[in-house]
Amino acid sequence: MRRGPRSLRGRDAPAPTPCVPAACFDLLVRHCVACGLLRTPRPKPAGASSPAPRTALQPQE
């Protein structure tokens, strides 16, 4: 049985490595992948409160 890629990581893992442009950090397996491989939360309806903060998931600027 294949172990989950995150099984051996501790709570104090270092911050995610910056991804190259057009790559996003996959928080579930802790590495950079093409952004198109990840599915982001559904966008909030117009006028919804509290926009989601920027995270390491998004491409580096």
Partner: antibody, heavy 117, light 111 residues
Framework: EVQLQESGPSLVKPSQTLSLTCSVT????????WNWIRKFPGNKLEFMGY???????YYNPSLKSRISITRDTSKNQYYLQLNSVTTEDTATYYC???????????WGQGTTLTVSA | DIVLTQSPVSLAVSLGQRATISCRAS??????????MHWYQQKPGQPPKLLIY???DLESGIPARFSGSGSGTDFTLTINPVETDDVAIYYC?????????FGGGTKLEIK
């Protein structure tokens, strides 16, 4: 809108193998994560495992070596195989897909499995 | 495994009042400044429905009566005001560490 639909037997005998299919529409299983979750009669939910965009699998250690999750990208389906079932595997089985934080925002309706001789 | 303990197991609240459900994790579910804690509602014969993700973010289409708070090991789901349609079982879930785990559920009833 992503839609998931489970299919498979409703009754399996002890020691047999359970095989379930999750058919996905509205998105490709070559992106994201594709999970199996089950709910036992006492209302406990258990995460069983996933297969992700790259075909990488993760299995809950509680299921030991009994579980296998595979996929057929040409059919946009993924599959659960659970070997050597017992009455303890009686549950409602769901397929679901999470977004980037692991929160599962799309679920199938579930298929109820009874393991009985 | 991270164990999630929900309390109370069942809760009866009057219409229009506040319902508060607690979820305590056996270890922190925070990483990268994110709380990997989510809340679901499940009604009989239906799959769970995502209400809150990342501890406090309201899922699209969920009414603002639902809110989440907390970080580290202690999290709270609040429903205010409670409506008849809220009768269900509520679950917390963590995705910080494998295997992902769920709380035991809290059954909400109307008093």
């Amino acid at each position: 809108e992503v839609q998931l639909q489970e299919s498979g037997p409703s009754l399996v005998k002890p020691s047999q193998t359970l095989s379930l299919t999750c058919s996905v529409t509205g998105d490709s299983i070559t992106r994201g994560y594709w999970n199996w979750i089950r709910k036992f009669p006492g209302n406990k939910l258990e995460f069983m495992g996933y297969i992700n965009y790259s075909g990488t699998t993760y299995y809950n250690p509680s299921l030991k070596s009994r579980i296998s999750i595979t996929r057929d990208t040409s059919k946009n389906q993924y599959y659960l195989q659970l070997n050597s079932v017992t009455t303890e595997d009686t549950a409602t089985y769901y397929c679901a897909t999470p977004h980037t934080y692991g929160a599962m925002d799309y679920w199938g309706q579930g298929t109820t499995l009874t393991v009985s001789a | 495994d991270i164990v999630l303990t929900q309390s109370p197991v069942s809760l009866a609240v009057s219409l229009g009042q506040r319902a508060t459900i607690s979820c305590r994790a056996s270890e922190s579910v925070d990483d990268y400044g994110i709380s990997f804690m989510h809340w679901y509602q499940q009604k009989p014969g239906q799959p769970p429905k995502l209400l809150i993700y990342r501890a406090s973010d309201l899922e699209s289409g969920i009414p603002a009566r639902f809110s989440g708070s907390g970080s580290g090991t202690d999290f709270t789901l609040t429903i205010n005001p409670v409506e008849t349609d809220d009768v269900a079982i509520y679950y917390c879930q963590q995705t910080s560490k494998d295997p992902w785990t769920f709380g035991g559920g809290t059954k909400l009833e109307i008093k």
